[in-house]
């Protein structure tokens, strides 16, 4: 015959069971708290280190560009893409219109000092964007030249010259002595013309966006 459990033993069992449940619950909650804290700290540290990295990158660039204009982009809006102020941005590049009248070589050197090159135009969309900010009675040097006068046009950044993606005005280029290209407004449209490199013109600089 099985001896009957005494009431105090039953109570002790219930109490023990409850203690075990509460212990598991408390330990779980503690573990969750610890996990949450750790992940918060880790996340905070990650964000903090990202911010620190960003700030140090910004400081580094500020040696060259006193002011940067940045926008958030990327799938999580976590990346910043920046252009020097007051440059304009289009796709992955920044553009600066120089109204200083200089020779082609001096214009390119001027862009170079700013970490850029005279503009290389790759698409009609890019040209349309650039021309929105140009004056129709002015001409602007492009990063396109033919130094030997052999009609071997070359872009300053070594991008291959593709005849199919050029926007010469009708009848241009037309002189082997005119070895540098400008963009100007003629016959109701913007297009390219070959001119003498030593004749001072305005110019357009282009650089890659700065990602931080």
């Amino acid at each position: 015959m099985v001896p009957e459990e005494e009431p105090q033993d039953r109570e002790k069992g219930v109490w023990w069971f409850q203690l075990k449940v509460w212990s598991v619950a408390v330990v779980s909650i503690l573990l969750l708290c610890v996990c949450f804290t750790v992940s918060s700290v880790a996340s905070h540290n990650f964000m903090y280190s990202k911010t620190v990295k960003r700030l140090s990158k910004l400081q580094e660039y500020q040696q060259y560009y006193p002011s940067l204009t940045c926008v958030m982009e990327g799938k999580d809006m976590e990346d910043w893409s920046c252009c020097p102020t007051p440059w304009t941005s289009f796709q992955s590049s920044c553009y600066f219109i120089s109204t200083v009248m200089q020779s082609w070589t001096k214009s390119q050197n001027n862009c170079s000092v700013m970490g850029a090159d005279l503009v290389v135009i790759n698409t009609k969309e890019e040209q349309d964007f650039i021309t929105q900010n140009l004056k129709i009675n002015s001409a602007y040097f492009l990063g396109l030249s033919d130094p030997k006068g052999w009609r071997h046009w070359q872009w300053v950044d070594q991008t291959p010259y593709n005849k199919n993606v050029t926007f010469w005005h009708s009848g241009e280029p037309n002189s082997p002595d005119e070895r540098c290209a400008i963009i100007n407004f003629r016959s109701e449209e913007w297009g390219w013309n070959d001119v003498h490199c030593h004749v001072p013109q305005k110019s357009i600089c282009k650089m890659k966006k700065i990602y931080i």
């Epitope: 200089q102 020779s103 082609w104 070589t105 001096k106 390119q108 050197n109 030249s145 130094p147 030997k148 006068g149 002189s175 082997p176 002595d177 070895r179 540098c180 001119v195 003498h196 490199c197 030593h198 004749v199 001072p200």
Partner: antibody
């Protein structure tokens, strides 16, 4: 043989005008940019004006801008320099020179013998 | 404007000896591999004559005792063995931008 022959120099009073001419021969004149370069007595050479082969471009230093005008007549193989409001400091030998393009610029490969302009009262 | 400074102003060299003329530009007259500096010789009562273009290219018909070198702002014209017919004033000229400008000239004489 390339030849450049200047004419039209002479003595003129301050405020007066002169027209210099340069007759070119021995080369295809219309294919070359041309310049006028002057040399005051005992001074360095000073470029005065340039005209492109197609006549599309003319350029002057500030010292003569608005007073001098360069032009050409490709049919006559001739280059001209119209000089108005002449000053004593314009006194010089005026050379006509042919331009040859080299890379991004040009140099002067042939020069005429020069014509003397004297501005004096 | 780019200012061209030549040195010395005058130079006396023995026949057969080397003559060296320097020209300094107030800013670079080179772009990549293009050096837009040229040298001219002017004898008394004559127009200038081109000797060297693009810093180091000898104009056709010019004796090879003449040579040029340099880049950026500093350029040199050398006459390796001075001849009597080399007595003249020598000028440097930059053409990287308008206006083209000339040096003040160096007078070369025989010692």
């Amino acid at each position: 043989e390339v030849q450049l022959v200047e004419s039209g120099g002479g003595l003129v009073k301050p405020g007066g005008s002169l027209r210099l001419s340069c007759a070119a021969s021995g080369f295809t004149f219309r294919s070359y940019g041309m310049s006028w370069v002057r040399q005051a007595p005992g001074k360095r050479l000073e470029w005065v004006s340039t005209i492109s082969s197609g006549d599309s471009y003319t350029y002057y230093p500030d010292s003569v801008k608005g007073r001098f005008t360069i032009s050409r007549d490709n049919a006559k193989n001739s280059l001209y320099l119209q000089m108005n409001s002449l000053k004593a400091e314009d006194t010089a030998v005026y050379y006509c020179a042919r331009q040859i393009y080299y890379d991004y610029a040009y140099y002067f490969d042939f020069w005429g013998q020069g014509t003397t302009v004297t501005v004096s009262s | 404007d780019i200012v061209m400074t030549q040195s010395p102003d005058s130079l006396a060299v023995s026949l057969g000896e080397r003559a060296t003329i320097n020209c300094r530009a107030s800013e670079s007259v080179s772009f990549r591999t293009s050096h837009l500096m040229h040298w001219y010789q002017q004898k008394p009562g004559q127009p200038p004559k081109l000797l060297i273009y693009g810093a180091s290219n000898l104009e056709s018909g010019v004796p090879d005792r003449f040579s040029g070198s340099g880049s950026g702002t500093d350029f040199t014209l050398t006459i390796s063995s001075l001849q009597a017919e080399d007595v003249a004033v020598y000028y440097c000229q930059q053409s990287i931008e308008d206006p083209p400008t000339f040096g003040g000239g160096t007078k070369v004489e025989i010692k």
